[in-house]
Interface confidence: low
Amino acid sequence: CRTSECCFQDPPYPDADSGSASGPRDLRCYRISSDRYECSWQYEGPTAGVSHFLRCCLSSGRCCYFAAGSATRLQFSDQAGVSVLYTVTLWVESWARNQTEKSPEVTLQLYNSVKYEPPLGDIKVSKLAGQLRMEWETPDNQVGAEVQFRHRTPSSPWKLGDCGPQDDDTESCLCPLEMNVAQEFQLRRRQLGSQGSSWSKWSSPVCVPPENPPQPQVRFSVEQLGQDGRRRLTLKEQPTQLELPEGCQGLAPGTEVTYRLQLHMLSCPCKAKATRTLHLGKMPYLSGAAYNVAVISSNQFGPGLNQTWHIPADTHTEPVALNISVGTNGTTMYWPARAQSMTYCIEWQPVGQDGGLATCSLTAPQDPDPAGMATYSWSRESGAMGQEKCYYITIFASAHPEKLTLWSTVLSTYHFGGNASAAGTPHHVSVKNHSLDSVSVDWAPSLLSTCPGVLKEYVVRCRDEDSKQVSEHPVQPTETQVTLSGLRAGVAYTVQVRADTAWLRGVWSQPQRFSIEVQVSD
C-alpha cells in the first residue's frame, strides 16, 4: 500500500483490544482545505515504541488503515480511498508492547466536517439569577455551533453539561454556580447540525470563585501603646486561602478573594471622619482609642460576610501629664504639646457610665506655647466637666485629623469636675479615745478618692484650744484614719480634715471638738 492511501488490507498487528487504561483518545477529523483532511488524537501513557494506525470503515463495510508511526496527527487527500461525501467510521489503534489499544469511534461525513475551535480569547463571566453566565466572541467563520461545558470543584471530578445550540456572533452558556467552592470550567464547540462532527479541543480553564466569598477567619492582636501614643494592629492568622481545582492552581484569575479592613474609631466622635477602609495587607497603627474592626471579603461577584471585632480603648493613665487650672473665667488644661500645627481632640466622660456618654471637643490646629505646652480652655457656662464628679479624660492628637489612622493618644487621665476642693471635703469625721494621751480620728473617704490619681493626700489638723498650737498630719490617700498622740488630758482640741489634689488644696471639714478626760486615781 502507498503511504498516501488508506490501505485495504489487514493491519500488520494482531486484532485484540487490551482494555488498558492508557491508549488513544479524543480523535478529531475534519476538512482543512478543498481536498485535504486531517485527523488528530491524543495518546495517554508512555509513548516510547508506540505505533499508531488510523482505521476507517466505509458504509459498504470495507475497512482500511493509515500508518501514522509515532505521530498523533495525519493528513490525507480526497484521493486516498476514503469516501469523504458519505458517512465513515474512524478510530485509532495503537500498537505498543505487544498489545493493541483502541480509541472510541467517531462516525461522520468528512466533507462537511469543519475544524471547530474552542472559545478563544476572553470569556466573560457574570452572575445571572443565581447561575453563572459565560459569554465569548464566536471564532471567525464558525457561527452555528453546539457547545458543551465541563466543570469540577477541588473535591469532585469533571461533570459534563450542555450549553445548547448557538447561532450568533457571540455565544453564551448558563452554568451552575457553587455557593461555597471555586470551580474550573472548560468549554468546547462543534459544528451545528453536522451529523457526527468532531468536538473541538477544550478551551483554557475558566476559574470561577464561589458565589459567597469565604468568611474571613482571621485573628488580630494589638500591641502595647508606644511612647508615640500609637499601637500596632497585627494579624495573628492570615485568611484561609480558597481551595482551587487542579487547573486553577498557580495563576487563577477570576477566583481572587480580596480582603479589606474597615476601621471605625469609636472614641472622639466630634472628629471629621470616623471610618476608613484599607487593604488587609497594610496593617495600620492605631491610637489608644476604642475601635470596631471589620474584615470584609469580596470576589468578582461582590462582597461576602464580614467578621467584626471590638478593640477596647487603652486605659493606661498618665499620672501627672495633665495640668488643670481653675480660674474665675473658666478652666484651662495644659499638656506637653506633640508638634507644630497639631489638632487635638479632648474627650471626657463621667466614670462608671457607658462609653456612649462621652463628650468631646476638637481644637483648631495649634503650635506649642513658649513652655512647650498645648492648651484647651472652657468657660463655666459651657457646662463642660461642670458636675462635681469624676471624669475620665483622653486627649488625642493628629497633624492630619481627616486621616483616621494618623491619630495618636497624648494622654489619658482622671479629673474631678466642678468645685473639687469643696466637693472633696471629707465628711463624718469622728474621734475615739485611743489611750491616755492619744485619739483615733476617722472620716468617710473623700469623693475625690473615686477618681484614680486625683487625691494626692489627706491632711489632718489638730488645734489645742488652750495654747492655740496647731499640728498638721499628712495621711496617704488610701487611708481614712490617723492616730493623734502626745495629747494632754483635760485640754480641749478641735480636729479637721481636708483632701488635696496635685494642684488644688482642699477645704477643711467642720471642726470636731474633743478632749481626753482626766483620770482620777483612787
Epitope: 473535591s155 469532585s156 471530578p157 469533571w158 461533570k159 451552575p176
Partner: antibody, heavy 119, light 107 residues
Framework: QVQLVQSGAEVKKPGASAKVSCKAS????????LHWVRQAPGQGLEWMGW????????HYAQKFQGRVTMTRDTSISTAYMELSRLRSDDTAVYYC????????????WGQGTLVTVSS | DIQMTQSPSSLSASVGDRVTITCRAS??????LAWFQQRPGKAPKSLIY???SLQSGVPSKFSGSGSGTDFTLTISSLQPADFAIYYC?????????FGPGTRLEIK
C-alpha cells in the same frame, strides 16, 4: 441502574492486611468519586477517605493515614481499599459509597463487607 | 474534627405519627449536611443532602431543614419500614463525620 457490589466477608489475623473491592456498574465509573466508610459492630459510621477513579487521586482521614491505601482499576470499574497492620478494633463492616455529581454528598452505597480481625 | 451530636438518642413512636430528629454540629457547616437511614443488617440509605434536598427516589414524607450548626430531619406519617437508625453527616470539612445515630422504635 447504579450498583456498587462489594467483595465477601474476610477473617484476618492481627498484623495482617485486608483488601476490600467495590465494583461499580450502571454509570461511568471515572465520573464519580468513591468514598469508604466503616462501621464497627453496634457502633456508628466512620469516614475513611475517597478515591478519584478518574486519575487515582486520594484523600485519607488522618486517623487512617499510613495504614490505608485506596486504588482503582478503571478497566473493570472497580475500586479497592486495603487496610494494613490490622488490629482487633478494625473489626467492622466496610462500605463504599458513591459521591453525587455536583455535590460531595453520597447517593449510593455498597452492601458492605465484614472484616473480622481475630487471633 | 467537627463533632456531630444527635438528639434524642432513641425515640418510640406509633405508625402514623410525625417525628423530628435534631442534629447539631460543633461549628458552622453551612448546609453541607446529609441524613441516612440504616435498617438492621443493611447498608445506609441516603435520604437528604444539602440539609434539605431530597435524594431521588426518596418519598416526600422525609424532609430536612437547618443551616450553620442546627439541623432537623422530620418524618411524617410513620410506616413500619421507617423504624430504623437515622444518622446525620457533615461533609463540609475533612474528616467527614457522622452523628452517633437516633434509633426510631415502634411504641
Amino acid at each position: 441502574q447504579v450498583q456498587l457490589v462489594q467483595s465477601g466477608a474476610e477473617v484476618k489475623k492481627p498484623g495482617a492486611s485486608a483488601k476490600v473491592s467495590c465494583k461499580a456498574s450502571g454509570y461511568t465509573f471515572t465520573d464519580y468519586y468513591l468514598h469508604w466508610v466503616r462501621q464497627a459492630p453496634g457502633q456508628g459510621l466512620e469516614w475513611m477517605g475517597w478515591i478519584n477513579p478518574n486519575n487515582g487521586g486520594t484523600h485519607y482521614a488522618q486517623k487512617f493515614q499510613g495504614r490505608v491505601t485506596m486504588t482503582r482499576d478503571t478497566s473493570i470499574s472497580t475500586a479497592y481499599m486495603e487496610l494494613s497492620r490490622l488490629r482487633s478494633d478494625d473489626t467492622a463492616v466496610y462500605y463504599c459509597a458513591r459521591e453525587m455529581g455536583g455535590t460531595t454528598a453520597f447517593d449510593y452505597w455498597g452492601q458492605g463487607t465484614l472484616v473480622t480481625v481475630s487471633s | 474534627d467537627i463533632q456531630m451530636t444527635q438528639s434524642p438518642s432513641s425515640l418510640s413512636a406509633s405508625v402514623g405519627d410525625r417525628v423530628t430528629i435534631t442534629c447539631r454540629a460543633s461549628q458552622g457547616i453551612g448546609n453541607y449536611l446529609a441524613w441516612f437511614q440504616q435498617r438492621p443488617g443493611k447498608a445506609p440509605k441516603s435520604l437528604i443532602y444539602a440539609a434539605s434536598s431530597l435524594q431521588s427516589g426518596v418519598p416526600s414524607k422525609f424532609s430536612g431543614s437547618g443551616s450553620g450548626t442546627d439541623f432537623t430531619l422530620t418524618i411524617s406519617s410513620l410506616q413500619p419500614a421507617d423504624f430504623a437508625i437515622y444518622y446525620c453527616q457533615q461533609y463540609n470539612i475533612y474528616p467527614y463525620t457522622f452523628g452517633p445515630g437516633t434509633r426510631l422504635e415502634i411504641k
